[in-house]
């Protein structure tokens, strides 16, 4: 691969009310189901058009949840999650956690490894900048000698 | 929003071969379902062949089974359509779908044969 893809990660609360036909996503994962390996967490896979979360507009595929309700989805078998979700009553909390790819360098496939990478000009530029106010400063200094 | 670009049609004679591609682009590829269909001038959009998300499972129309080969690559965003001994009536547009796969959190449910959110434009094979 020649470059490197890099994710900014937030994570955000989203209250759904079911409608007629529920909530309207599909979810991967789960322990006995890895999406993305050493992960088995559960990810939407897919959004129905005119669902509940379609309509919403904030629920995206490929998000991870982390917790329906406020129960915690780790470690869970798929089925397991799929009923947690089936009876999560009319009004449903989902803790999301939404992944923002930022591509850095040359175009290279998106990896099935660790989704908590931050990419490295959100380090680099915050650096540079107070690098340049250090020095700023500094010669400000200098010339009230 | 998933991108889809189909490639490799084109005019092969009678009893030869083709292989399709289908990149993908825009979210996850690994996650989704994904679909081959086909649609004959004059004629209704046809199912030819699906591939599950996790690359286990494959389903073929009657009319191309033992014939097509349907395969992904999710290193490469991509999957493909062997097709072998290829008739006249395989001529066609070729349409390349997509779909998130894993189960419904609301019931389970067959999915519809034509029940995908993404299509490519497709690419033209004819069979003379």
């Known amino acids: 691969m020649n470059g490197r893809v890099d994710y900014l990660v937030t994570e955000e609360e989203i209250n759904l009310t079911r409608g007629p036909s529920g909530l309207g996503f599909n979810i991967v994962g789960g322990t006995d189901q890895q999406y993305v390996s050493n992960d088995s967490g559960i990810y939407v896979s897919r959004i129905k058009e005119n669902g509940a979360a379609a309509l919403d507009g904030r629920l995206q595929e490929g998000d991870k949840i982390l917790s329906v309700n406020g129960q915690d989805l780790k470690n869970l078998l798929h089925q397991d999650a799929v009923d947690l979700f089936r009876n999560a009553g009319y009004a449903v909390s989902l803790r999301v956690q939404h992944r923002l790819q930022v591509q850095n360098g040359p175009i290279g496939h998106r990896g099935e490894g660790d989704p908590s990478g931050i990419p490295i000009f959100m380090v680099l530029v915050p650096v540079f900048a107070l690098t340049m106010v250090a020095a700023w400063a500094f010669m400000r200094y200098r010339q009230q000698l | 929003e998933v991108q889809l670009v189909e490639s490799g049609g084109g005019l092969v004679q009678a009893g030869g071969s083709l292989r399709l591609s289908c990149a993908a682009s825009?979210?996850?590829?690994?996650?989704?379902?994904m679909g081959w269909f086909r649609q004959a001038l004059g004629k209704e959009r046809e199912f030819v062949s699906t591939?599950?998300?996790?690359?286990?499972?494959?389903n073929y129309a009657d009319s191309v089974k033992g014939r097509f080969t349907i395969s992904r690559d999710n290193a490469k965003n991509t999957v493909y359509l062997e097709m072998n001994s290829l008739k006249p009536e395989d001529t066609a547009v070729y349409y390349c779908?997509?779909?998130?796969?894993?189960?419904?959190?609301?019931?389970?449910?067959?999915?519809?044969?034509?029940?995908?959110?993404?299509w490519g434009q497709g690419t033209q094979v004819t069979v003379s």
């Open positions: 779908a997509a779909r998130g796969g894993g189960t419904s959190v609301d019931s389970d449910y067959d999915v519809g044969e034509f029940e995908y959110d993404y």
């Open positions: 825009g979210r996850p590829f690994n996650m989704y379902d």
């Open positions: 591939v599950s998300w996790t690359g286990s499972s494959t």
